[in-house]
């Protein structure tokens, strides 16, 4: 007799989830010599242990602590790039500027990037049919709690100047409800972080407006200033040229406006 299964509003666990996590772990530890000591089977066991047999609306940060411990990693605290609603460009940037790091350039972020997962209460099964949606079902679901946990730790580790890429094409350039707005902003440590610099990425080629004057950016500035961290903002008018010139600043198109 088929068991009744809870139907959630969100998509189910990514297919081949265990294999994907394990394969990513192996790949990451091969590429990053400083993480070669990591035992990927133990990482998978800790990951699995965080959500298997648990109600997918009852996950806590505590559930992920064994995984956090295994995935402990030191990145240069003054080379952190946060992002909100503009992941692809942030990742393209750190692929070129190799000494800068987004969360997804760390082991734990790399393992989980773009994946969905959840289990079921009291069974060892992974739910491939549906998982809780943050809005429609519950916020304490396995994926949301994971990202909240790793994002908090990543922000807490930051020092000196922290950069954040924001999407200037969105109606809310800074969104208080995003992971950046709700978690990372509030976990930057004022005793370590001197400045948060926002890079507002323009969408339209002919868009020459100063988006640093946007009301939501002013709201971000206010939040940051109240936390005794300086705020700075710059427009990235031409993201294509920006990336090209990071890659090759001596290229003729970077030493001329033409």
């Amino acid at each position: 007799v088929p068991r009744w299964r809870q139907q959630w509003s969100g998509p189910g666990t990514t297919k081949r989830f265990p294999e994907t996590v394990l394969a990513r772990c192996v790949k990451y530890t091969e590429i990053h010599p400083e993480m070669r000591h990591v035992d990927c089977q133990s990482v998978w066991d800790a990951f699995k242990g965080a959500f298997i047999s648990k109600h997918p609306c009852n996950i806590t940060e505590e559930d992920y602590q064994p995984l956090m411990k295994l995935g402990t990693q030191t990145v240069p605290c003054n080379k952190i790039l946060l992002w909100s609603r503009i992941k692809d460009l942030a990742h393209q940037f750190t692929q070129v500027q190799r000494d800068m790091f987004t969360l997804e350039d760390t082991l734990l972020g790399y393992l989980a990037d773009d994946l969905t997962w959840c289990g079921e209460f009291n069974t060892s099964k992974i739910n491939y049919q549906s998982c809780p949606d943050w809005r429609k079902d519950c916020s304490n679901n396995p994926v949301s709690v994971f990202w909240k946990t790793v994002s908090r730790r990543f922000a807490e580790a930051a020092c000196d100047v922290v950069h954040v890429m924001l999407n200037g094409s969105r109606s809310k350039i800074f969104d208080k409800n995003s992971t950046f707005g709700s978690v990372e902003v509030h976990n930057l440590q004022p005793e370590k972080v001197q400045t948060l610099e926002a890079w507002v990425i323009h969408g339209g080629r002919e868009d020459s407006r100063d988006l640093c004057q946007d009301p939501t950016i002013k709201e971000l500035e206010s939040i940051i200033s109240k936390r005794n961290i300086q705020f700075s903002c710059k427009n990235i008018y031409r993201p294509d040229k920006f990336l090209q010139c990071v890659k090759n600043p001596e290229d003729s198109s970077c030493t001329s406006e033409i």
């Epitope: 008018y237 990071v246 600043p249 001329s256 406006e257």
Partner: antibody
Framework: QVQLVQSGAEVKKPGSSVKVSCKAS????????ISWVRQAPGQGLEWMGR????????HYAQKFQGRVTITADESTSTAYMELSSLRSEDTAVYYC??????????????WGQGTLVTVSS | EIVMTQSPATLSVSPGERATLSCRAS??????LAWYQQKPGQAPRLLIY???TRATGIPARFSGSGSGTEFTLTISSLQSEDFAVYYC?????????FGQGTKVEIK
């Protein structure tokens, strides 16, 4: 607010070198362009070269190529301009200036207070 | 390199009057032109960039126009604090180059 604070006045002998510093206080330094511009007494402004601190990329005006070296230390948010083989015509006020960008619209929106370098035997 | 030529070298104007300063580039610099103000003993200050956009905190009496090779800086009603030397600068091609400056003095 961000300020560019330059080192003090220098008196140098012909043939020697001078190194002027420019510290970005209270602000961000890395993904900007720091330029050096000089102004001889009673004369106009002359752009010497630039550095993008985060990328370590420099670009010099032909006139100063081989004689000027621009460097930056990201950890202290400080840029340096070293001019060698000094002659009397190098007597000038040397300014550092920041451009908000390193790839587009290179106008200089923030200037240091200037450093007077006098070359005299 | 691109040569920037400013005219006149000196402009004598009474307070409250309009001042028009010209800057010509030896080849097109598109709209990649800035204007700076410099007072004696001080560093230059950015007034206009992109040929016509006022920098932060610059009063509305300052306006810039032009593109290509011909540019104009207009000060609609001169105040006492506006008497200074004004420089144009192109940032279209390396090396960046400045005009020789226009001194705006009290008539």
């Amino acid at each position: 607010q961000v300020q560019l604070v330059q080192s003090g006045a220098e008196v140098k002998k012909p043939g020697s070198s001078v190194k002027v510093s420019c510290k970005a206080s209270g602000g961000v330094f890395s993904y900007y362009t720091i330029s050096w511009v000089r102004q001889a007494p009673g004369q106009g402004l002359e752009w010497m070269g630039r550095i993008i601190p985060s990328l370590g990329a420099t670009h010099y005006a032909q006139k100063f190529q081989g004689r000027v070296t621009i460097t930056a230390d990201e950890s202290t948010s400080t840029a340096y301009m070293e001019l060698s083989s000094l002659r009397s015509e190098d007597t000038a006020v040397y300014y550092c200036a920041r451009s908000d960008s390193f790839y587009y619209a290179y106008y200089m929106d923030l200037w240091g207070q200037g450093t007077l370098v006098t070359v005299s035997s | 390199e691109i040569v920037m030529t400013q005219s006149p070298a000196t402009l004598s104007v009474s307070p409250g009057e309009r001042a028009t300063l010209s800057c010509r580039a030896s080849q097109s610099v598109s709209s990649n032109l800035a204007w700076y103000q410099q007072k004696p003993g001080q560093a230059p200050r950015l007034l206009i960039y992109g040929a016509s956009t006022r920098a932060t905190g610059i009063p509305a009496r300052f306006s810039g126009s032009g593109s290509g090779t011909e540019f104009t800086l207009t000060i609609s009603s001169l105040q006492s604090e506006d008497f200074a030397v004004y420089y144009c600068q192109q940032y279209n091609n390396w090396p960046w180059t400045f005009g020789q400056g226009t001194k705006v003095e009290i008539k």
